[in-house]
């Protein structure tokens, strides 16, 4: 039961995380105009990975896409790449993990196969989460660098007569969404990897031995005791069950109308 719960929870957490990564990647507010210690402007600027927007106090908002690839900063391209890789890996991970879920029956899939798929999806979620966190962190670092550079020469002008206010940008909502989403995907991936350990059949078998009570030929099968060897060199010991140890979670059930094929 614990394995199923861990796997299910890992899947749900990763699903939320990947949805968040997608949302963050699409959001326009990666960087927003810094309003602190600035003249009050009737125009608010904010930028995303794909376009920059201007919202006027009149309510009119205009967004312009970055219709160039070569003209964009390498760092922005790197952030885009990291986020896309994160989304792709996360999406594949989700697809793999759906088939790996214990609560879903697909033919006569072995537990070992499900364990491998769970591990694969877990690793994918971990890498996906790390990509998102890295992407957001790179962008945040870029913002911090630019912020202090623009603060250093915030007012530029001709002999101090005419002043040009330099627009400074600070962290936008998308960065926080990205960090949280990346973290959730990472946690989900770790949970999947933990669930994988519970799913995998152990190398050491659970031996069952028959005890002959006096006057009765009743076979007693100890359930929860691992016997790596029999009891001494009793040649009458019969091997009744020679499978991997299974908890109630792993007991095969027949497909019902609620199972997905």
């Amino acid at each position: 039961m614990a394995v199923t719960a861990c796997q299910g929870l890992g899947f749900v957490v990763s699903l939320i995380g990947i949805a968040g990564i997608i949302a963050a990647t699409c959001m326009d507010q990666w960087s927003t105009q810094d309003l602190y210690n600035n003249p009050v402007t009737a125009v608010f600027n904010y930028q995303g990975l794909w376009r920059s927007c201007v919202r006027e106090s009149s309510g009119f908002t205009e967004c312009r896409g970055y219709f160039t690839l070569l003209g964009l900063p390498a760092m922005l391209q790197a952030v885009r790449a990291l986020m896309i890789v994160g989304i792709v890996l996360g999406a594949i991970g989700l697809l793999v993990s759906i088939f790996a879920l214990k609560c879903i029956r697909i033919g006569s899939m072995e537990d070992s196969a499900k364990a491998n798929m769970t591990l694969t999806s877990g690793i994918m979620f971990i890498v996906s989460g790390l990509c998102a966190i890295a992407g957001v962190s790179v962008f945040a670092n870029m913002l911090v660098t630019n912020f202090w550079m623009s603060t250093a020469n915030m007012y530029t002008g001709m002999g101090g007569m005419v002043q040009t206010v330099q627009t400074r940008y600070t962290f936008g909502a998308a960065l926080f969404v990205g960090w949280v989403a990346g973290g959730l995907t990472l946690i989900g991936g770790v949970m999947m990897c933990i669930a994988c350990r519970g799913l995998a059949p152990e190398e050491t078998n659970y031996k069952a031995v028959s005890y002959h009570a006096s006057g009765h030929s009743v076979a007693y099968k100890p359930g929860g005791f691992k016997a790596s060897t029999g009891f001494g060199s009793n040649t009458k010991n019969k091997k009744i069950y020679d499978g991997g140890a299974r908890t109630e979670d792993e007991v095969q059930s027949y497909p019902s109308k609620h199972d997905y094929v």
Epitope: N45, E56, S58, Q166
Partner: antibody
Amino acid sequence: EVQLVESGGGLVKPGGSLRLSCAASGFTFSNSAVSWVRQAPGKGLEWVSSITSGVSYTYYADSVKGRFTISRDNAKNSLYLQMNSLRAEDTAVYYCTRQFKGNALDYWGQGTSVTVSS
Amino acid sequence: DIVMTQSPSSLSVSPGERVTISCKSSQSLLNSGNQKNYLTWYQQKPGQPPKLLIYWASTRESGVPDRFSGSGSGTDFTLTISSFQAEDVAVYYCQNDYFYPLTFGAGTKLELK
């Protein structure tokens, strides 16, 4: 057709109060930023106050800050300007305007006259 | 506050003449986000409320005759009437629409010569 109709102007003594109203029609009032602009007799235009749509941020000219309060009632399609501690220099025609692209004031009412005199 | 300086303060013009009105702001009105200048021009005829002519320094409002044009960037702006008409007799105002308070210029009065 866009229409802005101001009301509430009149003669008031210095230190007195007055509340101007502006009834808007012909456009989605709740989605628009609106402003008050005044013009003293024989003088130029002076922006007084603005209120944005949505969260309703308010902005004021330094000369009226702390004395005037701009507000809106989207349900009634109305804009208001509560004027307290009126001074002789507040005597002017007050125009209700709508803000448009570029924050430009594209529609203006006919104005309501406010006279502050003892 | 942003100071808007208009010149000349008044001008007598003959019909068909080209008119240029200058407006200077104490700070740049250029927004880096969209590369637009937040300067607006208005026309006010006697006894009437002002009328929007040009916004974003050079975008003509719909219904405004094409003899009116706006130009300039940053701090220096110009309103041009390519061929002055009798109905253009009015006071013209420029306005800073970038910084609060949204200050107006003192106005330029155009009279018929």
